[in-house]
């Protein structure tokens, strides 16, 4: 009282930090610093982040909240989790689509676009690995289909159809003689 030296940062608890003249308690996640504390070890004036903005961490210095990201519709992105005061929008791909990173060293913050997953059924193949973080992994041809070039061809239903060796092995055509 009445002195002129600013007090040392000697506050109970570990969430105090010097802001201007005094050691202040910071703002919780989801709040920005409106004004620093006005006395030693005091509480700063903190306000809730306005709509469409967020701050994910406790902080002593942010005088404004970060703007929530908008998912890129051009890249077919959708919001998996909406933005809140404490967390940014989480963008991803809708079911049936997978993330294709736009950079070689892919991390969670890397730009990406969404690609439709391969439909193994439409290719007459077994699904070996379901599509989520990467494209669907298709396996061998479904029963009633055989490998021909890059695709699966339907087994012939009559003797008029030609049945090469691979076809015969899969379709059992020779057993029909």
């Amino acid at each position: 009282q009445g002195g002129t030296r600013s007090p040392r940062c000697d506050c109970a608890g570990d969430f105090h930090k010097k802001i201007g003249l005094f050691c202040c308690r910071g703002c919780p996640a989801g709040h920005y610093l409106k004004a620093p504390c006005t006395e030693p070890c005091g509480n700063s004036t903190c306000l809730v982040c306005p709509q469409d903005t967020f701050l994910a961490w406790e902080n002593h210095h942010n005088s404004e909240c970060a703007r929530c990201q908008a998912c890129d519709e051009q890249a077919s992105q959708v919001a998996l989790e909406n933005c809140s005061a404490v967390a940014d929008t989480r963008c991803g791909c809708k079911p049936g689509w997978f993330v294709e990173c736009q950079v070689s060293q892919c991390v969670s913050s890397s730009p990406f676009y969404c690609q439709p997953c391969l439909d193994c059924g439409a290719l007459h193949r077994h699904t070996r690995l379901l599509c989520s973080r990467r494209d669907t992994d298709c396996g061998t041809c479904l029963p009633g289909f055989y490998e021909h070039g890059d695709g699966c061809v339907s087994c012939p239903t009559s003797t008029l159809g030609s049945c090469p060796e691979r076809c015969a092995a899969v379709c059992g055509w020779r057993q029909m003689f």
């Epitope: 030296r5 201007g20 409106k34």
Partner: antibody, heavy 116, light 107 residues
Framework: EVQLVESGGGSVQPGGSLRLSCAAS????????MSWVRQAPGKGLEWISY????????YYADSVKGRFTISRDNAKNSLYLQMNSLRAEDTAVYYC?????????WGQGTPVTVSS | DIVMTQSPSSLSASVGDRVTITCQAS??????LSWYQQKPGKAPKLLIS???NLETGVPSRFSGSGSGTDFTFTISSLQPEDIATYYC?????????FGQGTRLEIK
């Protein structure tokens, strides 16, 4: 709109007293620390006193310690400076200022003249 | 007490000139430094806080930089309405102290 309006200045003889007031409006007065800063004629700015938002902590420049008292009434949105044992060197324009780290809002000032 | 040494004490420049004012603190004040503009007969006006943070509504031709003990205030292109006295101020420690001011006039 944030406004700070000082009043109470005037002429006084050496050894006399004055009480300055600062009326605040347009913001939550009780959330902010407040200060008095003065400026002698043709001179620079001199900080003289600070009071915390609750009024529980006060600080003074050595030049006024023991003679000036800062106080506030949050119910009335008002800041005060009681000046006793005034000297010729206290002649200045007195400003109240809002503390937000820096002094982000100032009043227009009230002049005090100490002369015999 | 922390002594704030501001220079130059006065300067004359032409409209459109780049103007630089420096402020030196007698000890480390981190970035707790502000710059004020004061026109004759008026109250000071905060331009920059935290050494480089431009206040809302202040023209972008004003800028500040520095940390620790050495700070700079710049007007990138001087305008006639910038004629005023400019002060630096530290709020790292009580007592709060100001530089002695820089009086800026037009050539």
């Amino acid at each position: 709109e944030v406004q700070l309006v000082e009043s109470g200045g005037g002429s006084v003889q050496p050894g006399g007293s004055l009480r300055l007031s600062c009326a605040a409006s347009g913001f939550t007065f009780s959330s902010y620390g407040m200060s008095w800063v003065r400026q002698a004629p043709g001179k620079g700015l001199e900080w003289i006193s600070y009071i915390s938002s609750s009024g529980g902590h006060t600080y003074y420049a050595d030049s006024v310690k023991g003679r000036f008292t800062i106080s506030r009434d949050n119910a009335k949105n008002s800041l005060y400076l009681q000046m006793n044992s005034l000297r010729a060197e206290d002649t200045a324009v007195y400003y109240c200022a809002r503390y937000s780290g820096a002094f982000d809002r100032w009043g227009q000032g009230t002049p005090v003249t100490v002369s015999s | 007490d922390i002594v704030m040494t501001q220079s130059p004490s006065s300067l004359s420049a032409s409209v459109g000139d780049r103007v630089t004012i420096t402020c030196q603190a007698s000890q480390d004040i981190s970035n707790y430094l502000s710059w004020y503009q004061q026109k004759p007969g008026k109250a000071p006006k905060l331009l920059i806080s935290d050494a480089s943070n431009l206040e809302t509504g202040v023209p972008s031709r004003f800028s500040g930089s520095g940390s620790g003990t050495d700070f700079t205030f710049t007007i990138s292109s001087l305008q006639p309405e910038d004629i005023a006295t400019y002060y630096c101020q530290q709020y790292d420690n009580l007592p709060i102290t100001f530089g002695q001011g820089t009086r800026l006039e037009i050539k």
